[in-house]
């Protein structure tokens, strides 16, 4: 049996960002499990004093696109599209610096989901990064277009 499937997103937690678009899942049953866990994580985040407004504005959609990445329509085999590295780095190092420190020291918050690691993402100018998922972080936009 192959690992990796493209299937329509059927959840609620990330519907405002993903709609019913096709997402990549590592196994057929993963979507339901991750949906339950991201719902629990968002509930926890919503009641947390550790999350600033400037962080949550972009961290929530970023987490959704990371947990349920769009399928790469240009690939002949099921393949996820990654977050854009420049946005990932601004999120981790600027907008959500204290939140990331807290999350890294409390890995159980995201349960089955790992915290995104920006080092794992292709460099912005590489061919692999051409199809990355852009959240629309203003500083990253500026950096992306002027460098």
């Amino acid at each position: 049996e192959e690992d990796g499937f493209c299937q329509p997103y059927r959840g609620i937690a990330c519907a405002r960002f993903i709609g019913n678009r096709t997402v990549y899942m590592e196994s057929l049953h993963m979507q339901g499990e991750i949906e339950n866990q991201i719902t629990a994580a968002f509930t926890m985040i919503g009641t947390s004093s550790h999350l600033s407004d400037k962080c949550s504005q972009f961290a929530i959609p970023s987490l959704c696109h990371y947990a349920f990445p769009y399928c790469d329509e240009t690939s002949s085999v099921p393949k996820p599209r990654d977050l854009c590295r420049d946005e990932c780095e601004i999120l981790e190092n600027v907008l959500c610096q204290t939140e990331y420190i807290f999350a890294r020291s409390n890995p159980m918050i995201l349960m089955r989901l790992k915290l995104p690691n920006c080092e794992d993402l292709p460099q912005p100018e590489s061919p692999e990064a051409a199809n990355c998922i852009r959240i629309g972080i203003p500083m990253a936009d500026h950096h992306h277009h002027h460098h």
Epitope: P80, D82, R85, S105, M108, D120, Q123
Partner: antibody, heavy 120, light 109 residues
Framework: EVQLVESGGGLVQPGGSLRLSCAAS????????IHWVRQAPGKGLEWVGQ????????YSADSVKGRFTISADTSKNTAYLQMNSLRAEDTAVYYC?????????????WGQGTLVTVSS | QAVVTQESALTTSPGETVTLTCRSS?????????ANWVQEKPDHLFTGLIG???KRAPGVPARFSGSLIGDKAALTITGAQTEDEAIYFC?????????FGGGTKLTVL
């Protein structure tokens, strides 16, 4: 079916080089870390290093730093372990294993291993 | 470099509950060590059982569970079966490297 197949092992003299391959099938390595782990005869496991094939980002054990290099070719869905300046203590069966970048799944699939013998 | 220590051998009976532990020389094992448990069966057949302290890999029977007990990571087999006879390795993450324990040989008699 998910499979990892190592190849490239063999007998090599101290100071020599070998390149091991880990060919993946049934999944796309860009969504995973590929680890190299070794087991010396009659001993336990030792982590050698890992790569995120998507970006080329690597980590490796102190015992192999400066001698071993991990790389990947995503178009071939294959990871590599380039071993230089080999020593007798590098004699072991070398395994590759996968670990999801996105989800905590443990190192669920392993290859069958390839034996590297360093001896004069 | 950290040293990870496991019981060298344990014996249990079918149906019994057995707990294997994994200690770190640097202090208490925490969730940030992302404890992994790997099973080695004869002929060097390795399977990942548990990741991130307590997450079972897909397809792993529910009798295997991971946790933290005191200052150690633990693998508990609830209702051991004869096919669980194997060597079990734990691996802990230390910021930028993984360190394996020496392995526990579990005999199910």
């Amino acid at each position: 079916e998910v499979q990892l197949v190592e190849s490239g092992g063999g007998l090599v003299q101290p100071g020599g080089s070998l390149r091991l391959s880990c060919a993946a099938s049934g999944f796309n390595i860009t969504g995973y870390y590929i680890h190299w782990v070794r087991q010396a005869p009659g001993k336990g496991l030792e982590w050698v290093g890992q790569i995120s094939p998507n970006s080329g980002s690597t980590y490796s054990a102190d015992s192999v730093k400066g001698r071993f290099t991990i790389s990947a070719d995503t178009s071939k869905n294959t990871a590599y372990l380039q071993m230089n300046s080999l020593r007798a203590e590098d004699t072991a069966v070398y395994y590759c294993a996968r670990d999801s970048r996105r989800y905590v799944l443990s190192w669920d699939y392993w290859g069958q291993g390839t034996l590297v013998t360093v001896s004069s | 470099q950290a040293v990870v220590t496991q019981e060298s051998a344990l014996t249990t009976s079918p149906g019994e509950t057995v707990t294997l532990t994994c200690r770190s020389s640097t202090g208490a094992v925490t969730t940030s060590n992302y404890a992994n448990w790997v099973q080695e069966k004869p002929d060097h057949l390795f399977t990942g059982l548990i990741g991130g302290t307590n997450k079972r890999a897909p397809g792993v029977p529910a009798r295997f569970s991971g946790s933290l007990i005191g200052d150690k990571a633990a693998l508990t087999i609830t209702g051991a079966q004869t096919e669980d006879e194997a060597i079990y390795f734990c691996a802990l993450w230390y910021s930028n490297l993984w360190v394996f324990g020496g392995g526990t040989k579990l005999t199910v008699l």
